[in-house]
């Protein structure tokens, strides 16, 4: 009872857990497709323990493998002026280091205005995840429609 | 034919109240964002306001926030904006249309909806 | 929060080519902005012409004949509306509207420019 009393005083850091869950803070320009995260207590339903942002992308900071989560919503969905059609892609990879390299999450709106999904995939330490929105106009902000997190499952 | 049609006009107090509404008719009203703007007696435009397709995101212009709600019904096909805190500067035409402006241009509008702030 | 004028007025021959700038004032490079034009007769609602981000990114309401297009002078940080085969129903008013890429900042419309057709 007492080790149960002292483990939950402990960061959740400290014992591997190592979680995030991110709002949408802005878009990039038009040539950059990255979407660009935020998060903390002051923003309501988001934190990071264990992984940072950096400059809106999400740094991993433990090895393991982790479960990696995004929806998105778009709040554009039918263009009035159709100046970036559908098909509109959302990719979350890992974009550096370089040589780590790789997409874990590819989708497509095809007709809807909302997508989302999961995956359990290894990270590492030093892996920045970026989340790329290619086709769109724009995402919606509101934190129901559109988040993005991860999870340390295990080692 | 897309039809956008603004109503809720009218005179009103300095301090007072007034709900604008917009009807929208021949296309798929809950796929599209949806915008406000207006226009001041032989002046230029002014965005006012945007909403998106869900009605989860809203935008504002900065003179505006605080005293404006943008909202939608999209089982009426029906756009709003809720102004609160009226001035005498407020007084102007104010057009619905089609669109964010954010992005993307504002395809089709309405014939506009006169208010008038005044004592 | 953007900046962009407009020259008041501008007077051309039918026939002739005009060009339209909207000028980013507030320091911003007009290569990051997305432009939209539209037009005004008195006593009508604007008519929304096009859009220009880059020759990439844009579009042409699908009643604007071709005389009509969009571009960008990074010289002048300015967005172009070119008219070319000037015609008198061309005699208008013409607003741009900037909206700085991803920024979700409210788009801001310049002050019109007249132009008559002589």
């Known amino acids: 009872q007492r080790f149960a009393q002292a483990q939950q005083q402990l960061p959740l850091e400290s014992l591997g857990w190592d979680v995030a869950e991110l709002q949408l803070n802005h878009t990039g320009p038009q040539q950059d497709p990255r979407l660009y995260w935020q998060g903390g207590p002051a923003l309501g339903r988001s934190f990071l323990h264990g992984p940072e942002l950096d400059k809106g992308q999400l740094r991993i900071h433990r090895d393991g493998i982790y479960m990696v989560h995004i929806q998105v919503t778009l709040a554009i969905c039918s263009s009035t002026t159709a100046s970036r059609h559908h098909p509109t892609t959302l990719a979350v990879g890992i974009c550096s280091p370089a040589s780590r390299s790789i997409s874990l999450l590819r989708l497509s709106f095809h007709q809807g205005c909302t997508i989302a999904s999961q995956r359990l995939t290894p990270l590492a330490r030093g892996d920045t995840l970026c989340t790329n929105l290619t086709g769109t106009l724009l995402p919606s902000r509101n934190t129901d429609e559109t988040f993005f997190g991860v999870q340390w499952v295990r080692p | 034919e897309v039809q956008v049609q603004e109503s809720g006009g009218g005179l009103v107090h300095p301090g007072g109240s007034l709900k604008l509404s917009c009807a929208a008719s021949?296309?798929?009203?809950?796929?599209?964002?949806m915008s406000w703007v207006r226009q001041a007696p032989g002046k230029g435009l002014e965005w006012v306001s945007a909403?998106?397709?869900?009605?989860?995101?809203?935008f504002y212009a900065e003179s505006m926030k605080g005293r404006f709600t943008i909202s939608r019904n999209n089982a009426k096909n029906t756009l709003y904006l809720q102004m609160n805190s009226l001035k005498s500067e407020d007084t102007a035409v104010y057009y619905c249309?089609?669109?964010?402006?954010?992005?993307?241009?504002?395809?089709?509008w309405g014939q506009g909806t006169q208010v008038t702030v005044s004592s | 929060q953007a900046v962009v004028t407009h020259p008041p007025s501008l007077s051309a021959s039918p026939g002739s080519s005009v060009r339209l700038t909207c000028t980013l004032i507030?320091?911003?490079?007009?290569?990051?902005?997305?432009i939209s034009w539209y037009q005004q007769k008195t006593g009508s609602p604007p008519r929304y012409l096009l859009y220009?981000?880059?020759?990439?990114?844009?579009?042409?309401s699908s009643g604007v004949p071709s005389r009509f297009s969009g571009s960008k002078d990074a010289s002048a940080n300015a967005g172009l509306l070119l008219i070319s085969g000037l015609q008198s129903e061309d005699e208008a008013d013409y607003y741009c509207s900037a909206y700085k890429s991803g920024s979700y900042k409210a788009p801001v419309f310049g002050g019109g420019t007249h132009l008559t057709v002589l």
């Open positions: 021949g296309f798929t009203f809950d796929t599209y964002a």
């Open positions: 909403i998106s397709w869900s009605g989860g995101e809203t």
């Open positions: 507030s320091g911003d490079n007009i290569g990051g902005y997305d």
């Open positions: 220009y981000y880059s020759d990439s990114y844009k579009h042409q």
């Open positions: 249309a089609r669109g964010m402006g954010l992005a993307e241009g504002l395809t089709d």
